[in-house]
């Protein structure tokens, strides 16, 4: 149904509070360097304009598309060019080119200081002074650092943040109350940000078909009792919602997400019995609850997959008549039977099945050709299973820090051209997957590991695209979304890499390392480790172990010494010489 004024329609649907929050997120995600006050001013102007349109939908400019209204607002900022440089060139373009231009200037890695959490007392004082402004500031700070954060979910986290402060600021021990709550919100929000970033990358880099396939697999796992037609309906709506949010159309996205949640609650009998507990919640919690929903139980007595996809004589006919529907049905049927598989695995299996049919359906006897297709797809299941088992064994043996070190060595050998801080950051992130997933039961380990790896590798790919340094990384990132992880796993020592000349200053330490927090101490040591691998990419595991052992002993000795700096100055060069000899 067409509305005279789109902005009035969204204001009415969303309500003033959510409307203002979404406008603030939109501005903060696009104008990441602007101060909070400037955004607040623009938010108030946009809100006043929307209210005027609610009063009279025929009023001047009320009929304009929301994206055009936002673009006009941004382009009217006097300091736009001096703050944002070439982003101002977008203003010379007409919509929709202008919108695309703004999107291309979103910075996934803005040069902003880390979002530090003030002391509980200071937090509570600021919150009590003006809690709307305080929550607005939270939305602003998160949005500018995460320009693709799923906006309606961010409103949910802001609500959680507000609730935590409301409760804990009245507590006797504010810190004891707040710290675990805010840590949990932060951790969940960071995962949510990475998940949405992967969805946007999937749509933007690999197209709608890739995103729809991902969604069919995920929803079929969660709602195995729903019919394929029902899953397809939800996927179509979900694709629209995701496209809108990824495109920066946050008011439309949030409104359509509400509609999707409403639809799912109205049709819960044909989707999942687990929806009941979500559907009684208010708007934001309802949609969040659906997003995080526990999977439903598998229907009993599902027929063997081979019946419809191998034994049936109509396979090639069905494939020819409606390729995407037939493959979608295969993905649905396979996914609902395998909640323990990762999305990547399911999509690789579907891709393998498709490739087999492409080949076999062109033969004179297709059935003879594809009769053993499931046996041939087995390696796609065995490879990640084996990999997870091996890595979790290594994790159990070494612990998180040791495991991170092993990964730092491994990934530096794969892509030594990548900067040392980046390699350390990703080794640490990859290592933390062990902590998250290896303690889980066997049935959840596999999907946990691969699904997390997909998020981490996506971030690596996005940042690498901005400043490419390794052809191998580019290849793994761009060739196929579902094969990213296997592609990185398959990389070994880069034979084309010319080892970095030895620089003693990369391995020179001072007494200040002794007083650093444990995490920062680890990072420093891991930086040295990566530098070492860049210097000797083909060093054996034994050599690396020896060097790391000597290094740890040196740090312990000097940090325990009375005159720490003298110890570092004297023993440092000896250690460097010893390490060079070990690696010679």
């Amino acid at each position: 149904e067409a509305h005279k004024s789109e902005i009035a329609h969204r204001f009415n649907d969303l309500g003033e509070g959510h409307f203002k929050g979404l406008v603030l997120i939109t501005l903060s995600q696009h104008l990441q360097k602007s101060p909070f006050e400037e955004h607040v001013k623009l938010v108030n102007e946009v809100t006043d304009f929307a209210k005027a349109c609610v009063a009279d939908e025929s009023a001047q400019n009320c009929g304009k598309a929301i994206a055009t209204l936002f673009g006009d607002k941004v382009c009217a900022i006097p300091s736009l060019r001096e703050t944002y440089g070439e982003l101002a060139d977008c203003c010379a373009k007409e919509d929709p080119d202008r919108v695309e231009c703004f999107l291309q200037h979103k910075d996934d890695n803005p040069n902003l200081p880390p979002f530090e959490r003030p002391e509980p007392e200071a937090l509570c004082t600021a919150f009590k002074e003006n809690n709307d402004r305080f929550i607005g500031h939270y939305l602003y700070e998160v949005s500018r650092r995460h320009p693709y954060f799923y906006a309606p979910e961010l409103l949910y986290y802001a609500e959680k943040y507000k609730n935590a402060l409301t409760e804990c600021c009245e507590a006797a021990d504010k810190a004891a109350c707040l710290t675990p709550k805010l840590d949990a919100i932060k951790e969940k929000a960071l995962v949510s940000s990475a998940q949405q970033r992967l969805k946007c990358a999937s749509l933007q880099k690999f197209g709608e078909r890739a995103f729809k396939a991902w969604s069919v697999a995920r929803l079929s796992q969660k709602f195995p009792k729903a019919e394929f037609a029902e899953i397809s309906t939800i996927v179509t709506s979900l694709t629209k919602v995701t496209k809108e949010c990824c495109h920066g159309d946050l008011l439309e996205c949030a409104d359509d997400r509400q509609e999707l949640a409403k639809y799912m609650c109205e049709h819960q009998d044909s989707i999942s019995s687990k929806l009941k507990e979500c559907c009684v919640k208010p708007t934001l919690q309802k949609a969040h609850c659906i997003l995080e929903i526990q999977r439903d139980e598998l229907p009993t007595e599902l027929p063997d997959l081979a019946v419809d996809f191998v034994e049936d004589k109509e396979v090639c006919k069905n494939f020819a008549e409606a390729k995407d529907v037939f493959l979608g049905t295969f993905l649905y049927e396979y996914s609902r039977r395998h909640p323990e598989y990762s999305i990547g695995m399911l999509l690789r299996i579907a891709k393998g099945y498709e490739a087999k049919l492409e080949k076999c359906c062109a033969e004179a006897d297709p059935h003879a050709c594809y009769a053993k297709v499931f046996d041939e797809l087995q390696p796609l299941i065995d490879e990640p299973k084996k990999l997870v088992q091996q890595n979790c064994e290594l994790f159990d043996k070494l612990g998180e820090y040791g495991f991170q070190n092993a990964l730092a060595v491994r990934y530096t050998q794969k892509a030594p051209q990548v900067s040392t801080p980046t390699l350390v950051e990703y080794a640490r992130k990859l290592g933390s997957v062990g902590t998250k997933c290896c303690s889980l039961p066997e049935t959840e380990r596999l999907s946990c590991t691969e699904n997390y790896l997909a998020l981490i590798l996506n971030r690596l790919c996005i940042l690498h695209e901005k400043t490419p340094v390794s052809e191998r990384v580019t290849k793994c990132c761009t060739e196929s979304l579902v094969n990213r992880r296997p592609c990185f796993s398959a990389l070994h020592v880069d034979e084309t890499y010319v080892p970095k000349p030895f620089h003693a200053d990369s391995f020179t330490f001072h007494a200040d390392i002794c007083t650093l927090p444990e995490k920062e101490k680890q990072v420093k040591k891991q930086m040295a480790l990566v530098e070492l691998v860049k210097h000797k990419p083909k060093a054996s595991e034994e050599q690396m172990k020896t060097v790391m052992g000597d290094f740890a002993a040196f740090l312990k000795k000097c940090c325990d010494a009375d005159n720490k700096e003298a110890c570092f100055t004297e023993d440092g060069p000896k250690l460097v010489a010893k390490c060079q000899a070990t690696l010679a």
């Epitope: 090639c316 006919k317 020819a320 008549e321 004179a364 059935h367």
Partner: nanobody
């Protein structure tokens, strides 16, 4: 939408010949193996012959081997069945299918062999 339209059937005396055609549309014809299937009155479908997408591989039921020849012209999206030395037991409705399918999704063309 996939469409298969058969033609070339008719009444022929035993020992005679006919050439059936099947015009295909709505899918990538050259990417799919094709088959001819027949159904005699009051009987179930019987597979007759198959050909690969490129036309390099062919298969025949024992009952027609040496008498029937399957071929295709990918530039015209058309499948053919040359039937020689026809016998009364070849009387049936003939239809073309994609891959190894036996189910009929087209009109078919009737072949009657009778003196």
């Amino acid at each position: 939408e996939v469409q298969l339209v058969e033609s070339g059937g008719g009444v022929v005396q035993p020992g005679g010949s006919l050439r059936l055609s099947c015009a295909a549309s709505g899918f990538t014809f050259r990417s799919f193996g094709m088959s001819w299937v027949r159904q005699a009155p009051g009987k179930g479908p019987e597979w007759v012959s198959s050909i690969s997408g490129s036309g390099s591989d062919t298969l025949y039921a024992d009952s027609v081997k040496g008498r029937f020849t399957i071929s295709r012209d990918n530039s015209k999206n058309t499948l053919y069945l040359q039937m020689n030395s026809l016998r009364p037991e070849d009387t049936a409705l003939y239809y073309c299918t994609i891959g190894g399918s036996l189910s009929r999704s087209s009109q078919g063309t009737l072949v009657t062999v009778s003196s």
